[in-house]
């Protein structure tokens, strides 16, 4: 059967910046900001687009050592990311796969809402363990908050980059963030 679980969580980080860090660069960020949750992410095949296969390894002590994810959709315009967990742990035994959809929506206060859908495709009459749903949610929260903390501590990271001309700067050409751009023009 298919069991669908939907959750929403909020972040103080703007949608575009969060999508760039949490979704597009999670492979690099997760082991760095949450080593207790994820030890490494390895690209098995593909370039990040649909069809890409990633191996996510977990630290020593966790009962299951890795999962493999397949990227199904990356929508840069609407900040949407669909992927499926296709291997590891109970996948292949009680579960066929877990299909996940993440959509990051901007909020008026400058933050964002993450709308998350997890579809558990079970084999035969197997049901989804409540503990599985809880663990998935906790892992997602752990990663999100770790990335959020990193972004709050590194205000210049994962911001939109604008190329400012030499005339504007009165000197050499360089990349600066949108915040810097605003600051520059107000002067």
């Amino acid at each position: 059967g298919v069991f669908n679980y939907e959750t929403e969580t909020t972040s103080v980080i703007p949608a575009a910046r969060l999508f760039k860090a949490f979704i597009l660069d999670g492979d690099n960020l997760f082991p760095k900001v949450a080593p207790q949750a994820i030890s490494s992410v390895e690209n098995i095949e593909g370039n990040g687009g649909p069809g890409t296969i990633k191996k996510i390894s977990f630290p020593e002590g966790l009962p299951f050592k890795y999962v493999k994810d397949r990227v199904d959709e990356v929508d840069h315009t609407n900040f949407k990311y669909n992927y499926a967990v296709i291997e590891g742990g109970p996948i292949g035994d009680t579960l066929e796969k877990i299909s996940n959809e993440i959509k990051i929506v901007a909020t008026p206060d400058g933050g964002s809402i993450l709308k998350i859908s997890n579809k558990y495709h079970t084999k035969g009459d197997h049901e989804v363990k409540a503990e599985q749903v809880k663990a998935s949610k906790e892992m997602g929260e752990t990663l999100l908050r770790a990335v959020e903390s990193y972004l709050l501590a590194h205000s210049d990271a994962y911001n939109e980059q604008k190329l400012i001309s030499e005339e504007d700067l009165g000197g050499e050409q360089k990349l600066i963030s949108e915040e810097d751009l605003h600051h520059h023009h107000h002067h």
């Epitope: 009962p63 299951f64 742990g89 035994d93 503990e131 599985q132 906790e138 892992m139």
Partner: antibody
């Protein structure tokens, strides 16, 4: 059906060796750690050893460290426990069990267990 | 190592009774606590995992609760097949996993 079957137990003299086997079926064997638990008849349960799904990590109770060796052959869905320098206090029923869990969790439990194999060390 | 202490060590009860077995950990183990049932000559069988989750196929008269250091296993209405020995086990600090000493449930 998920199943574990132990074999290899028997009556041996102190100081000798014995190899127990645990054959698994009904699940993706290499995804799961396998644990050995022992029980002196009429007494409680004592954890003995654990091996990771790949076989790369092994763990032992202090009481058997340096004497017992755990290994696995994932092509045969089998875990082995080589018990050397056996002592009278190693006499027990030995169970193998799958370390079960859910994805992304640190929590784990033992399910299922094999039927057990009796090891008696006596002169 | 984390010590697990069960109480009582044994108890007598009648069919239809409500029975509670407690398990205390020597330090906080969050919800990393499992319960097993063992009948004479048989292997232990998982009843409850993660303190309160009922294992598939286990009758709903069994329930688990607790968090931190204190946990309980409750059988709401004892059936003849429930007379057995029950063990708690922590998986918070592993290795080693540790078990309680067991609670033997006998017919009154």
């Amino acid at each position: 059906e998920v199943q574990l079957v132990e074999s290899g137990g028997g009556l041996v003299q102190p100081g000798v060796s014995l190899r127990l086997s645990c054959v698994a079926s009904g699940f993706t064997f290499s995804n799961y750690d396998i644990t050995w638990i022992r029980q002196i008849p009429g007494k409680g349960l004592e954890w003995v050893s654990r091996i990771s799904g790949s076989g790369g990590s092994t763990y032992f109770a202090d009481s058997v460290k340096g004497r017992f060796i755990i290994s696995r052959d994932n092509s045969k869905n089998t875990v082995y426990m080589q018990m050397n320098s056996l002592r009278a206090e190693d006499s027990a029923v030995y169970y193998c069990a799958r370390r079960d869990s859910v994805l992304f969790s640190m929590n784990s439990w033992l399910d299922p267990w094999g039927q057990g194999t009796l090891v008696t060390v006596s002169s | 190592d984390i010590q697990m202490t069960q109480s009582p060590s044994s108890l007598s009860a009648s069919v239809g009774d409500r029975v509670t077995i407690t398990c205390r950990a020597s330090q906080s183990i969050s919800s990393y606590l499992n319960w097993y049932q063992q009948k004479p000559g048989k292997a232990p069988k998982l009843l409850i995992y993660a303190a309160s989750s009922l294992q598939s196929g286990v009758p709903s008269r069994f329930s688990g609760s607790g968090s931190g250091t204190d946990f309980t296993l409750t059988i709401s209405s004892l059936q003849p097949e429930d007379f057995a020995t029950y063990y708690c086990q922590q998986s918070y600090s592993t290795p080693p996993i540790t078990f309680g000493q067991g609670t033997r449930l006998e017919i009154k």
